[in-house]
Every structure is written in C-alpha cells, then in structure tokens.
C-alpha cells in the first residue's frame, strides 16, 4: 500500500490529518461519496479540540459530520466507537423529529451555528467537511 | 502533457468477458481519481464507474453493477475495467478520464480516446 | 436517479451567430453541471465547469450560467470549430448523468 505523508493541495492540516471544507451544500450521502472518491470521509469529531479547529474553520454555518444512524444506532463513518467517544450535541438532541413535513426522521448529524451538533434530513444541502488521516497505508486492493 | 491511453476493446460474444485497460501519463496518477464512460454507437454518453486514487472506494452505475469491477494499479499507472456476462446492450466506445476535484465536486477532464466493445454473436 | 434534459436537440447555425443550449435537471442540483464538447469521432471535451467557470484553454466565446435546475451553455459567435455536439452532465451525486446531447450543425 502507499502512505499519505503530506495533505493534498487545499486541504488543511492538523494533528496528523488531512481537512477540507466545503463552501457549497450537497446532501448527507453526496457529501459522503465525495469524501470517499477522494479517499477521505466525512469528518469524525473525537475530542473537543478537534471540534474547536473544526468549528474555527466552518463558522457559523450548517455543516454534514460523518455521524449517522441511517441503520438503526448512531454510527461513524470510519467505525470509530459513537457510545464511548466524543459527543457535542445541542440540548434535546438528537431527537429524530418528524414534523419537517419532509417524510422520515432526522438520520444525518451536523454542526449547526454554534458547533454544537444536531440531527436533520439527510437530504438537506449542507456544506461538509472531508477528514482522511496521514501516515494511514492505503491498503490498496489486489487487483483481480 | 496528460495522456490516456484506452486498449483492450474488440468483439466478444454475449456472456463473455473482456479487460479494458487505460495507461495514463504526465501526472501523479495515484492522486486522482478516474473514471469509465461510455457511448453506444450513435448515441449519447453514460457514466459507468469511478475509483478513488488509492482504489479502495468504487462506485458503479445499476446497469453494470455486480457484472463490472473498476481497479487500477498504481505502480504502473495504469486503470482497468473488468467486464463480465457481457450483453449487446454493452456495445460501446469506452472512455477512461481522470476526475478533477475542483470546488466541492469532481469534473472529467482529460479524456482517452476511446476503445470500442462489441458484444455480438 | 437524476435526469438531463437538453434543448434544442439540434440547431442549425451560421458561423458568427449566437448559440445557445439549455439543460434542465429533474432536481435541484445546485450549480453541479459540466458542459462537454464532442466532435464525430473523438473524445469528449470539457468546457465548463461547476455550471459556469471557463475549463483552462477553452476560449471565451463560451460561457455557462444557471443553478438549481435551469442551465445555460451560451457561445456568442459561433466559429468554424464549434460545429460539434454538445452535452451537459451533473456531478451532484451518482450516476453522474449526462444530458442527451445537443448537435450544432451548419446552416
């Protein structure tokens, strides 16, 4: 596999990983797929100082964080343990509301105007940011 | 200067399989990601799969999904399409590009020239 | 999936005259759009980006607008060169759909 030794050009870097932020919107999954086709993910919040330089850089704005419950419980994107690690929600959150008249509950995490998180529907067009860690082997798949 | 370079297209019959491979020249082939595109004879043009630079993360449209498998390896530059249970409706001009993330999503630019698959008994 | 309409499906034109192609997405795709040029035989060529920013190389003539849904691929004097078939495409989320195609001939 190959390593990841500095941040791609545009990409900002902090504590050995590697952030882009958006400035447009996009929904929850298009967001995420873009992330990945650029071998990254959405962000995964895992202490407050990560969400302190994540909040500095987004500003006051709706922005997608690699946290859903799409499938049952809430998940990260990268697998990082969502019950034992980190949260920042907004006071009575996540609540799963359905009055949005939009069809479903709130299944996608984001940060709102203060950093602090809150759930809503997936589809929304929000702004993103994409994380991938350095010194991380690729692990590039043996071709078939 | 980029150049890509498409081979392995030519006459197979339904059912079969065949390997298209896109060689790639005059950039950092590992740091982008590449794509398939395709056009029927005297028709329009279909996305048909895309692979991350690293090529852990693939995406593919539905009507080649589980029959197309998109790989690349990077040691020697070089991008593949690997098609299985081959239908008529998969006769076309294959195209590879490299995908350019540029402000929030990825554009196809440049394009190879080409590389014609017939499926046909 | 998101569907590409194009309009006109072809126009016949005179070099110097003002062209212009409309793209419709069936949603909201917000300014997510590629124009690409493909002449008989060859590979596509992307011309705008991001629904209105100019690739490298492509001359000025070209121009992109429009967001959400409605777009526009305007050349303002049609040259001897542009007599081509030209195609939108969204990249908002996959399939990356392509429009069916808008053919510019000669009048």
């Known amino acids: 596999g190959s390593e990841r030794t500095c941040c791609p050009v545009n990409w900002v870097e902090h504590e050995r990983s590697c952030y882009w932020f958006s400035r447009s919107g996009k929904a929850w999954a298009d967001a995420d797929n873009y992330c990945r086709l650029e071998d990254a993910h959405l962000v995964v919040v895992t202490s407050w100082e990560e969400q302190k330089f994540v909040q500095h850089h987004i500003g006051p704005v709706n922005t997608w964080m690699g946290l859903h419950d799409q499938n049952g419980p809430w998940k990260w994107v990268d697998g990082t343990d969502y019950e034992t690690g980190f949260k920042n929600w907004r006071p009575e959150q996540p609540d799963d509301w359905y009055g949005h008249g939009l069809g479903g509950g709130e299944d996608c995490a984001h940060f709102t105007d203060d950093g602090r998180w809150n759930d809503d529907v997936c589809q929304r067009p929000y702004r993103w940011v994409c994380e991938t860690e350095l010194d991380k082997a690729s692990q590039e798949p043996p071709l078939l | 200067e980029v150049q890509l370079l498409e081979s392995g297209g030519g006459l197979v019959q339904p059912g079969g399989s065949l390997r298209l491979s896109c060689a790639a020249s005059?950039?950092?082939?590992?740091?982008?990601?590449m794509t398939w595109v395709r056009q029927a004879p005297g028709k329009g043009l279909e996305w048909v799969s895309a692979?991350?630079?690293?090529?852990?993360?693939?995406f593919y449209a539905d009507s080649v999904k589980g029959r197309f498998t998109i790989s690349r390896d990077n040691s020697e530059n070089t991008l593949y399409l690997q098609m299985n249970s081959l239908r008529a409706e998969d006769t076309a001009v294959y195209y590879c590009?490299?995908?350019?993330?540029?402000?929030?999503?990825?554009?196809?630019?440049?394009w190879g020239q080409g590389t014609l698959v017939t499926v046909s008994s | 999936d998101i569907q590409m309409t194009q309009s006109p499906s072809s126009v016949s034109a005179s070099v110097g005259d003002r062209v212009t192609i409309t793209c419709r997405a069936s949603?909201?795709?917000?300014?997510?759009l590629a124009w690409f040029q493909q002449k008989p035989g060859k590979a596509p060529k992307l011309l705008i980006y991001?629904?209105?920013s100019l690739q490298n190389g492509v001359p000025s003539r070209f121009s992109g607008s429009g967001s959400g849904t409605d777009f526009t691929l305007t050349i303002s004097s049609l040259q001897p060169e542009d007599f081509a078939t030209y195609y939108c495409?969204?990249?908002?989320?996959?399939?990356?759909?392509f429009g069916p195609g808008t053919k510019v001939d000669i009048k």
């Open positions: 949603q909201d795709i917000s300014s997510w």
């Open positions: 692979i991350s630079g690293s090529g852990v993360n693939s």
């Open positions: 005059g950039f950092t082939f590992r740091t982008y990601a």
């Open positions: 991001a629904a209105s």
């Open positions: 590009a490299k995908a350019r993330a540029v402000a929030g999503s990825h554009w196809f630019d440049p």
């Open positions: 495409q969204q990249t908002n989320s996959f399939p990356f759909t």
